[in-house]
Interface confidence: medium
C-alpha cells in the first residue's frame, strides 16, 4: 500500500485468442440483481481525480454531518478524519453527534508509508446523492494519521468497499456495504464510473468538476457503451479476478499467466495506477518502449519519476500502443479483454513547468503485492461490482478519455485454456498480508 | 500566470551586503530551477547562481563565490541571493529566472530559462 | 568555464533581411544551448531552447540550429521589432554562460 500511488496515496498457457468466437449464451443482458436503467440520483456524484482519489458525499451522525469520502474498493473499513488535521477542512465530530456509539476499541491500519489510527464506534450514515436509506454502520474515528490525508483533495475519509475478510482489526468488523444491503432493501451490488478528466485539473476546477458516479444498488446504462463482460470474482476479500493474458499493441507479453496474478490481482479504485508484478512490470516496459521507440524517454519517465513534457496539444498518443487485458469470462474456456489507451496510463499532472507544456506521469509501476487495476484503469471503463453473483463487470465508459483514432474496448469472446491454472494460490498464514 | 518578481536592490557601500528576494507564482516552484542573471550598465549577461529547491543543488559563478548564497523557501515560493562583501564591480540590474529542472523531460530536450523577472537595481558605491 | 563566443557582435540589417549570429563553444555543450532577445530596459525573452526548438508565442521567422560547439540563430525576414540584443546561452554545464550579446540594429 504505497503513498503516493495506493490512495490515500498510498498512487504461457495464458490463453491465446484462437480466432474461435463463442456465441453469447443469450443476445439479452442477464437478470441483473439491482434495478436497472436510470439512477439519476446517483449519476455525478463523485469528485475528483485519479492522482488523488475520487470522493462521494456523506453525512454522518444526529444532526447530519457532511463529509466527501474516498471510494475505495481496495479496503473494507469506513473511516474519517475525527480530529482536527492540518490537510482536513472539516472532520466529524462524536461529541455533536446524539447517535454515536462508542465500541471501545481501537484500530490501527499501518501502510508502506504512512499509517491511521483511530476508535471504533457506530453511528448513522446515508448518502445524499445515493439510496434514500439511512443505516447504522461502523466508523473508525481516525485520531492520528501520517501520510494519509493528502493536501488539496478535499476528501476527509475513506468508504473501503471490499470484504470483511480484510477488515481492520478483523474479520468480525462489518464493513460499510454489508450493513447497507443488511438493513436496506439495496441490492448487494455497486457500480463505478470514474471520468479522468485527460488534462490536469487545478483545486478550483476539481471542485466544479465531475469526476463520475457511484451507482448504488444497480446499473445505469447511460454511463456506458456497449456490452458488459463479466469476470467472476475469485475470493471474496478484495476484489479479486484472474488475468490470463496481456497484449501491448496486440503483441502477446508470452509470459506464464501465473506471473499477471502473482500474488493476487485486484480492482482498487483507491489505486492511482495500473501496478504489475515486477516481472511482467519489466516485460510491459519493455515493449510500451519499443512500441513508442519514435521518440526516447529517460528511464526516470519509466519509473514514475520524471515528468514528460511537450507543447500544449502537441501530445503524440499515436506514438504510444494500447494495452489489452484478458480477464477470465464467465464461462469456461472464455475470455474477454480490456484495452486502454496512453490517454488512461500517461497520467496527465497539474503541476506542470508553465500552462504552455502537457506533462504527463507513467502510471504504471511495479508492484510487490500482485497487479492492481487501479483508477487508470477504472478510467476507461464502467465498473460493475455485482457482489450478488460475485462477478465484476467491465464496459466501456461513456466517458473515458480517446482521440479520434482510437477508443477503450471491452471484446470477446475469446478462447482461453486452462484459466483456473492462472490464478496463484496464497500460502495460508497468520501473518497479514495488509500491509503491503 | 507565471510571475517572478524581484525585490532588494538598492544603493549599499563596497563591503556591505545586501539580500535580494525573488517571489514566484503561477508554476512549482518546487520542480524549477530558480537562477540569478546580472547585467552591469551597458554590459552583456552574466550568470551568478542558481538553485534546485526540490534537490537542493546550488551552484555559483567564480566571481561570487565565497561571497553569494542563494537560498529558497519553499513555503513562500521565494527564493533569495544574500550579497556579502558587495564590489563595485557587483553593480547591475539583478534578474531573476526559472527553468523547469530535470523533472520536467522535454521530448524535445530540456528547456532553458523561460520566464525572468522585471529585475533589480543593485549600486555599489561610497 | 565553457566559453560562448558570439558572432559578430554587432550588425547592421534592413527590415526583411535575413540575419544569422553564430554561437562557438569552447567545448562541446550537447544541444543544451538557447537564444535570447533584449531590448533596453527590458529582460531577455526566450527564442529559443535545446538549440533549435522554437519557444511558445515566438514567431517562426526566428529558427535555431547546431550541436556540439557551434551554434546558428537565423531570423529569416528582419522586422522592425526584431531590432535588439540577442544573446546565446549553455546550459549543459554549471557555470552557466552566455555569449556576449549580439546588437542587430537598423542599416
Known amino acids: 500500500t504505497q503513498h503516493g500511488i495506493r490512495l490515500p496515496l498510498r498512487s504461457g498457457l495464458g490463453g491465446a485468442p484462437l480466432g474461435l468466437r463463442l456465441p453469447r449464451e443469450t443476445d439479452e443482458e442477464p437478470e441483473e440483481p439491482g434495478r436497472r436503467g436510470s439512477f439519476v440520483e446517483m449519476v455525478d456524484n463523485l469528485r475528483g481525480k485519479s492522482g488523488q482519489g475520487y470522493y462521494v458525499e456523506m453525512t454522518v451522525g444526529s444532526p447530519p454531518q457532511t463529509l466527501n469520502i474516498l471510494v475505495d474498493t481496495g479496503s473494507s473499513n469506513f473511516a474519517v478524519g475525527a480530529a482536527p488535521h492540518p490537510f482536513l477542512h472539516r472532520y466529524y465530530q462524536r461529541q455533536l453527534s446524539s447517535t454515536y456509539r462508542d465500541l471501545r476499541k481501537g484500530v490501527y491500519v499501518p501502510y508502506t508509508q504512512g499509517k491511521w489510527e483511530g476508535e471504533l464506534g457506530t453511528d448513522l450514515v446515508s448518502i445524499p446523492h445515493g439510496p434514500n436509506v439511512t443505516v447504522r454502520a461502523n466508523i473508525a474515528a481516525i485520531t492520528e494519521s501520517d501520510k494519509f490525508f493528502i493536501n488539496g483533495s478535499n476528501w476527509e475519509g475513506i468508504l473501503g468497499l471490499a470484504y470483511a475478510e480484510i477488515a481492520r482489526p478483523d474479520d468480525s468488523l462489518e464493513p460499510f456495504f454489508d450493513s447497507l444491503v443488511k438493513q436496506t432493501h439495496v441490492p448487494n451490488l455497486f457500480s463505478l464510473q470514474l471520468c479522468g478528466a485527460g488534462f490536469p485539473l487545478n483545486q478550483s476546477e476539481v471542485l466544479a468538476s465531475v469526476g463520475g458516479s457511484m451507482i448504488i444498488g444497480g446499473i445505469d446504462h447511460s454511463l456506458y457503451t456497449g456490452s458488459l463482460w463479466y469476470t467472476p470474482i475469485r475470493r471474496e476479500w478484495y476484489y479479486e479476478v484472474i488475468i490470463v493474458r496481456v497484449e501491448i499493441n496486440g503483441q502477446d507479453l508470452k509470459m506464464d499467466c501465473k506471473e499477471y496474478n502473482y500474488d493476487k490481482s485486484i480492482v482498487d479504485s483507491g489505486t492511482t495506477n495500473l501496478r504489475l508484478p515486477k516481472k511482467v512490470f519489466e516485460a510491459a516496459v519493455k515493449s510500451i518502449k519499443a512500441a513508442s521507440s519514435t521518440e526516447k524517454f529517460p528511464d526516470g519517465f519509466w519509473l514514475g519519476e520524471q515528468l514528460v513534457c511537450w507543447q500544449a496539444g502537441t501530445t503524440p498518443w499515436n506514438i504510444f500502443p494500447v494495452i489489452s487485458l484478458y480477464l477470465m469470462g464467465e464461462v469456461t474456456n472464455q475470455s474477454f479483454r480490456i484495452t486502454i489507451l496512453p490517454q488512461q496510463y500517461l497520467r496527465p499532472v497539474e503541476d506542470v513547468a508553465t500552462s504552455q507544456d502537457d506533462c504527463y506521469k507513467f502510471a504504471i509501476s511495479q508492484s510487490s503485492t500482485g497487479t492492481v487495476m487501479g483508477a487508470v484503469i477504472m478510467e476507461g471503463f464502467y465498473v460493475v461490482f455485482d457482489r450478488a453473483r460475485k462477478r465484476i463487470g467491465f464496459a466501456v465508459s461513456a466517458c473515458h478519455v480517446h482521440d479520434e483514432f482510437r477508443t477503450a474496448a471491452v471484446e470477446g469472446p475469446f478462447v482461453t485454456l486452462d484459466m483456473e491454472d492462472c490464478g496463484y494460490n496464497i500460502p495460508q498464514t497468520d501473518e497479514s498480508t495488509l500491509m503491503t | 500566470e507565471v510571475q517572478l518578481v524581484e525585490s532588494g536592490g538598492g544603493l549599499v557601500q563596497p563591503g556591505g551586503s545586501l539580500r535580494l528576494s525573488c517571489a514566484a507564482s503561477?508554476?512549482?516552484?518546487?520542480?524549477?530551477?530558480i537562477h540569478w542573471v546580472r547585467q552591469a550598465p551597458g554590459k552583456g549577461l552574466e550568470w551568478v547562481a542558481s538553485?534546485?529547491?526540490?534537490?537542493?543543488?546550488?551552484s555559483y559563478a567564480d566571481s561570487v563565490k565565497g561571497r553569494f548564497t542563494i537560498s529558497a523557501d519553499t513555503s513562500k515560493n521565494t527564493a533569495y541571493l544574500q550579497m556579502n562583501s558587495l564590489r563595485a564591480e557587483d553593480t547591475a540590474v539583478y534578474y531573476c529566472?526559472?527553468?523547469?529542472?530535470?523533472?520536467?523531460?522535454?521530448?524535445?530536450?530540456?528547456?532553458?530559462?523561460?520566464?525572468w523577472g522585471q529585475g533589480t537595481l543593485v549600486t555599489v558605491s561610497s | 568555464d565553457i566559453q560562448m563566443t558570439q558572432s559578430p557582435s554587432s550588425l547592421s540589417a534592413s527590415v526583411g533581411d535575413r540575419v544569422t549570429i553564430t554561437c562557438r563553444a569552447s567545448?562541446?555543450?550537447?544541444?543544451?544551448v538557447a537564444w535570447y532577445q533584449q531590448k533596453p530596459g527590458k529582460a531577455p525573452k526566450l527564442l529559443i531552447w535545446?538549440?533549435?526548438w522554437l519557444y511558445s508565442g515566438v514567431p517562426s521567422r526566428f529558427s535555431g540550429s547546431g550541436s556540439g560547439t557551434d551554434f546558428t540563430l537565423t531570423i529569416s525576414s528582419l522586422q522592425p521589432e526584431d531590432f535588439a540584443t540577442y544573446y546565446c546561452?549553455?546550459?549543459?554545464?554549471?557555470?552557466?554562460?552566455f555569449g556576449q550579446g549580439t546588437k542587430v540594429e537598423i542599416k
Open positions: 529566472a526559472r527553468q523547469p529542472t530535470h523533472y520536467y523531460y522535454y521530448a524535445k530536450g530540456y528547456k532553458a530559462m523561460d520566464y
Open positions: 546561452q549553455q546550459y549543459s554545464y554549471s557555470p552557466f554562460t
Open positions: 567545448q562541446s555543450v550537447s544541444s543544451a
Open positions: 538553485i534546485s529547491p526540490y534537490s537542493g543543488y546550488t
Open positions: 535545446y538549440a533549435s
Open positions: 503561477g508554476f512549482n516552484f518546487y520542480y524549477s530551477s
